[in-house]
């Protein structure tokens, strides 16, 4: 009897969907896996004999509940499947946005980047998948743990009269507020303010 | 420098539980992936349970699926590890760890950049 694969998952990242597993321990010799996905009632082959344990699912449509499964095969024998169901507009894991920052003065000036989507239009980005996208960033002063919190309207934002000559730290996430759902924060970007460039009166 | 703080281990009987709590301080960064691994003493350390803290995305090792539960209050910085129907096989040293790197959900937490000092569960029989 052939083992089942084990330890199956969906790693699923900006619509990026690798289905993987693990190779059960079998002293006959190496197995190999055949791994389908359920479309209009009849499960369709995606990676056939694969010596791999993973397979890329990102083709599926976005909305709506896949099932997807896998078995591991010897020779004539196989496993028994194991199934999963996968929703990818529900179940992707939102990355991290770019962000642009760049100092004048007291301020920093920040552009913000939706994260791509593979498999798709060049220009195409999780923004428009998501009708509710919007960016949460958070700011703090370099070596301090209090931050500050806000929501931007647009893929820019400007945090004005800062303390001149201080590093400030700013990160951004996705954030679907219909879902309450949010995404990985991006890597800090640390920056130094300049001199304030008010003139005094 | 990131510290974690955890408690809530102790002894218990066999079928019993125990809610493990692990708080992140001194941080300098938003924390993505809080996790859980185990080492019992002789055997190799072994991921337990993950959690990205945007969604609430969670993962579990095959061997607590269905009895353990983890979970996260993000305003306190804290990941819980709620554990049921205890087994002996269970007994170890539980460390916390953190990450504030991307696409860690399925990596084992043994893996992630910060640990705590661990916290000993015992589930005696």
């Known amino acids: 009897m052939v083992p089942p694969p084990e330890n199956v998952r969906m790693n699923s990242v900006n619509f990026k969907n690798i289905l993987q597993w693990e190779s059960p321990a079998f002293a006959k010799g190496n197995l190999t896996f055949t791994a389908q996905y359920l479309s209009y009632r009849i499960f369709q082959d995606k990676c056939m004999n694969t010596t791999l344990t993973e397979c890329d699912f990102s083709s599926l449509s976005k909305y709506g509940d896949h099932t997807l499964r896998v078995r591991a095969e010897f020779a004539d024998e196989h496993s028994d499947w194991v199934n999963i169901t996968f929703c990818p507009v529900d179940d992707t894991i939102i990355g991290p946005p770019g962000m642009q920052v760049e100092v004048l003065a007291d301020s920093l000036h920040m552009r913000f980047l939706a994260p791509k989507i593979e498999n798709e239009y060049e220009t195409w980005t999780m923004k428009n998948v998501y009708n509710s996208w919007t960016y949460n960033v958070q700011y703090w002063k370099n070596g301090t743990d209090e931050k500050f919190q806000i929501t931007p309207q647009y893929d820019f934002e400007v945090l004005r009269n800062l303390e001149p000559w201080t590093t400030y730290c700013v990160q951004v996430r996705g954030f679907l507020p219909d879902r309450n759902k949010a995404g990985e924060w991006s890597e800090p970007v640390c920056e130094q303010t300049t001199h304030d460039e008010t003139v005094p009166s | 420098q990131v510290q974690l703080q955890e408690s809530g281990g102790g002894s218990v009987q066999a079928g019993g539980s125990l809610r493990l709590s692990c708080t992140v301080s001194r941080y300098t960064a938003s924390v993505n992936y809080m996790g859980w691994f185990r080492q019992a003493p002789g055997k190799e350390r072994e991921g337990v349970a993950t959690?990205?803290?945007?969604?609430?995305?969670?993962y579990y090792a095959n061997s607590v699926k269905g009895r353990f539960t983890i979970s996260r209050d993000n305003a306190k910085n804290t990941a819980y590890l709620q554990m049921n129907s205890l087994k002996p096989e269970d007994t170890a040293m539980y460390y916390c760890a953190v990450d504030f790197r991307g696409g860690l959900l399925y990596r084992p937490a043994y893996e992630y950049t910060y640990r705590g000092q661990g916290t000993q569960v015992t589930v005696s029989s």
């Open positions: 959690i990205f803290t945007g969604a609430g995305t969670t």
